[in-house]
Each structure stands twice: as C-alpha cells, then as structure tokens.
C-alpha cells in the first residue's frame, strides 16, 4: 500500500518546508484516497467486465450509495459552505459500511483496500474539525449497517462484483465532487 500523505520521501527530503494548512491536508488526503480507488478499480476491471457496462445498466441497482444533489449546496448553483460540509461528512460516514464490504473483495490489493478505508476515517476527522455545525451530522445506525453488510455479503458472485464496481465508482464521484467544493471554501 502507498505511504499515507505526509510520509512520502519528498516530505522527508524537505524538512524545512512549511507545514500543510488544514485545507491542504484535506486536499492531499482526498487525492491519496482517489489514488487508492484507482488501484482498486484496476484490479476490479481486470477481473470482471463490469467496467465496460454502461452507466444506465448499472444504475438499476438497489444500493443506496451517497450522491451529491443540488440541495446539498456543493455545486456552484446554490453553493453553501456549511450545508455542503455537512453533506460531505454525512456522505463519508454513510460510505464507511460499503468500504467495510470492500475489505474481503480484493486479492492482490488487499492492503490498498485497507488503506482506503483507514484514510477515509482520517479524512472524516479532518473534516469534522473544519465543520462548525456538527449537530447537523447524522451518524448511520450500526444495527442497520450490520444487516446491510450481511445482505451484501450474501449476494451471488456476479452481484458482488457489480456491487464492488458500483461502490468504487460512486465513492470516486463523491470524493471528486467533495474536493471540487472544498477547493471553493
């Protein structure tokens, strides 16, 4: 697995560099996670033909994956920093159960899947420090998450492959939208 942000050789080689600001650290963390997703997607796409399936075909699924909508305040029209930040944190918390599902789905990229999961936890902590309105953030119910996980793991092989692909694609899109909005803050 790649080294987490702030621990790569470039950082070691430049000890006198200015410490990262909170925004820079969040930006770097998201890019690190996106790199991880990219590696996981490579393995998924090599293993199955899901990546060739059209978006429309894949949209017919029962997964309730977090998605950015106009009302969330993360797009340019109706942009709202606080509303958007709440949506990003809430969405990441909702993705955690799906990232847990991914943990046993990879052979050669097992460490990478773990790195994505752990880095997301760190990202949530960074963002919670940035948010003013923590009361507005709803945490998913652990019982509901546990039964969802059981249900996902009980699917047949084809559905599990499709679920893996959908989670990775949706998580990537969510992170991209989140980072674009965060870059406006």
């Amino acid at each position: 697995a790649p080294v987490p942000p702030g621990e790569d050789s470039k950082d070691v080689a430049a000890p006198h560099r200015q410490p990262l600001t909170s925004s820079e650290r969040i930006d770097k963390q998201i890019r690190y996670i996106l790199d991880g997703i990219s590696a996981l997607r490579k393995e998924t796409c090599n293993k199955s033909n899901m990546c060739e399936s059209s978006k429309e075909a894949l949209a017919e699924n029962n997964l309730n994956l977090p998605k950015m909508a106009e009302k969330d305040g993360c797009f340019q029209s109706g942009f709202n920093e606080e509303t958007c930040l709440v949506k990003i944190i809430t969405g990441l918390l909702e993705f955690e159960v799906y990232l847990e599902y991914l943990q046993n789905r990879f052979e050669s990229s097992e460490e990478q899947a773990r790195a994505v999961q752990m880095s997301t936890k760190v990202l949530i902590q960074f963002l919670q420090k940035k948010a003013k309105n923590l009361d507005a953030i709803t945490t998913p119910d652990p019982t509901t998450n546990a039964s969802l996980l059981t249900k996902l793991q009980a699917q047949n092989q084809w559905l599990q492959d499709m679920t893996t692909h959908l989670i990775l694609r949706s998580f990537k899109e969510f992170l991209q939208s989140s980072l674009r909005a965060l870059r406006q803050m």
């Epitope: 890019r31 996106l34 797009f75 340019q76 990537k172 899109e173 991209q176 939208s177 980072l179 674009r180 870059r183 406006q184």
Partner: nanobody, 123 residues
Framework: QVQLQESGGGLVQAGGSLRLSCTAS????????MAWFRQAPGKEREFVTD???????WYADSVKGRFTISRDNAKNTVYLQMNSLRPEDTAVYYC?????????????????WGQGTQVTVSS
C-alpha cells in the same frame, strides 16, 4: 500526462461569439477534469471555467451566463462556447487538465497545459 492543443481563437467584434476547442492526446481523457484559463496582456493568468470527470461545471463570475464549457469524450475534446464577447475578454486562452478528475479555480490543481490560443475582442 496528456498533451493539449487549443484552437478556434481569433478576432471578433464586441457582442460576437467564438468557440474554442482543446484536443487531448496520450491519456484517458474521460477521467480528466478540464479547464480554461486566460491571461490578458500585463495580467496574471486567471480561471475561466472547468468541467469535472462526471460533468459538473464551475464558472468565474465574470463569464457566468455568457460562456459555456462542454466536453466530448469520444473526440477527446473540451469546448468553450463564448457569447456576448466584451473587449475585456481579450486574452490568450489556455486549456488545462487535472488527472484526478476534480478541477479547481487555481493553476496548481492542473498537471497538463496547452500552449494557448489568442482571442481578441474589438470594440
């Protein structure tokens, strides 16, 4: 990294329209966020608009409602439709690409740049 080539610049009268194109080669174009920046004589390069991998767009306030960014992944091309042009839109227009598919309003977010195309708006 992708190589970028802009085209479509030229001389146009105020109130007129122009469409810029930027064609990419050497990379998975559909996974990049694409942006347009511009640099007027004696000024710093500034953000105009961008379009993310999933199609979300952002515009600078100065061009909102007049300029439209779009992409054709099959042609590896991003477009900038410029309407109601003003003399202050005169600049060299640069195309830029972000391999993370995110984009943003600052130059540091982009890892590939084109050479630029001149747009001149006369009054």
């Amino acid at each position: 990294q992708v190589q970028l080539q802009e085209s479509g610049g030229g001389l146009v009268q105020a109130g007129g329209s122009l469409r810029l194109s930027c064609t990419a080669s050497g990379g998975t174009f559909s996974e990049y966020a694409m942006a347009w920046f511009r640099q007027a004589p004696g000024k710093e390069r500034e953000f105009v608009t961008d379009i993310g991998e999933s199609g979300g767009t952002w515009y600078a306030d100065s061009v909102k409602g007049r300029f439209t960014i779009s992409r054709d992944n099959a042609k590896n091309t991003v477009y900038l439709q410029m309407n109601s042009l003003r003399p202050e839109d005169t600049a060299v227009y640069y195309c830029a690409a972000d391999s993370y598919g995110v984009g943003g309003g600052a130059e540091r977010y982009y890892d590939s740049w084109g050479q630029g195309t001149q747009v001149t708006v006369s009054s």
